[in-house]
């Protein structure tokens, strides 16, 4: 056909190289995203299904954009928001799935998204009837005001020395040893 590199046959920024044999006067080396003997065809990059987990692929020209289905995130929708396997909860916390997201259920004394924040177990004022709360490595301890007892100072101590403990479980009389 007589076309040479001097005629500028390569489109879309393709690099023209003179052909090595008489049958091809030139060869176009195409930039990413283009193909064809003259780099005239745009490669359908979305046809390669680059977006994971059923994400919608948009070819912006200069880049791709993935729009993710519910429950997935990331540039390629590669992160499963419901997947506890990809979630590390620190300080003995456990991962809980559901609701399109996953969260950490933190061990006593810890809080925050990944259980990395130290929580004050006394912040909720757990000690009743004016008891004083002390944070302890294993949780909290209540120092009860006079006249109260129990782990949370919830039971009043009667003047005769008896305490108003909760009723005995069914089948047990007060005073019976609990098995």
């Amino acid at each position: 056909s007589g076309v040479t590199c001097a005629d500028g046959p390569c489109f879309n920024g393709g690099l023209c190289v003179g052909g090595a044999d008489p049958d091809s006067a030139y060869i176009c080396h195409c930039p990413p995203g283009f193909q064809g003997s003259n780099c005239e065809k745009r490669v359908d990059r979305c046809s390669l299904q680059p977006c994971r987990n059923g994400g919608l692929c948009l070819d912006l020209g200069h880049a791709l954009r993935c729009r993710c289905r519910a429950g997935f995130a990331g540039p390629r929708c590669e992160h499963d928001l419901d997947d506890c396997a990809g979630r590390a909860c620190a300080n003995g916390g456990t991962c809980v799935e559901g609701g399109g997201a996953h969260r950490c259920s933190c061990a006593l004394g810890f809080g925050g998204r990944d259980c990395r924040e130290r929580a004050d177990p006394c912040a909720a004022r757990p000690c009743a009837h004016g008891g004083r709360c002390y944070a302890h490595f294993s949780g909290l301890v209540c120092a009860c005001a006079p006249g109260y007892m129990g782990a949370r100072c919830e039971f009043p101590v009667h003047p005769d020395g008896a305490s108003a403990l909760p009723a005995a479980p069914p089948g047990l009389r007060p005073g019976d040893p609990q098995r």
Partner: antibody, heavy 128, light 112 residues
Framework: QEQLVESGGGLVQPGASLTLTCKAS????????MCWVRQAPGKGPEWIAC???????AYSASWAKGRFTVSKTSSTAVTLQVTGLTAADTATYFC??????????????????????WGPGTLVTVSS | DIVMTQTPASVEAAVGGTVTIKCQAS??????LAWYQQKPGQPPKLLMH???VLTSGVPSRFSGSGYGTEFTLTISDLECADAATYYC??????????????FGGGTEVVVK
Amino acid sequence: QEQLVESGGGLVQPGASLTLTCKASGFDFTSNAMCWVRQAPGKGPEWIACIYNDDGSAYSASWAKGRFTVSKTSSTAVTLQVTGLTAADTATYFCARSPYYTYGGAPSAYASGYFNLWGPGTLVTVSS
Amino acid sequence: DIVMTQTPASVEAAVGGTVTIKCQASENIYNSLAWYQQKPGQPPKLLMHDASVLTSGVPSRFSGSGYGTEFTLTISDLECADAATYYCQSDYYSTGGSYGFAFGGGTEVVVK
């Protein structure tokens, strides 16, 4: 530490032109788009334009085409040229980074669709 | 181009309370929504992207939900430091081949 700093703002006459500069430090300019967003007093942010650093591709809001031109001037700086300024262009102009992500063997970079780093802004006041 | 509509324009709540901000997109944007916090004299700060993914360092009191066209930002256990204006934002790609970004009108959060 990652930082963007805008400069070039000030008081300008209606009809004048202006060039704003955004300098980046503390991060690799590549695999990011550098964008311009403006905010008129008491209003919400309004996206103007971006330039993708890897190949220089620029894209802008339809209303900004013609009067606003974004360019990459060095490996750490981008500019926004504005012509035909009017009082309606009075705003704080922010430079913002929109990250792109690359994966080995992937056919392209992937746009994130958000802005994860902003400069403090430069105020442009158009008044006679 | 896409239009992002935020409600309410302003909301007031007490310290320790909860605030809910809604953002509606004029078309299906899947999960492509970001939330920003802006205080006077400062640039917007990214709180969340992909509708529900918190940015590093943002407290878990902030949470996001929604998909398609309806999205919500919830701030629980309100603190005085949460007093700010909050914006939603998405990106769009039109059939004409133009790519860009759109912001909501903003919601001012007043903490009593």
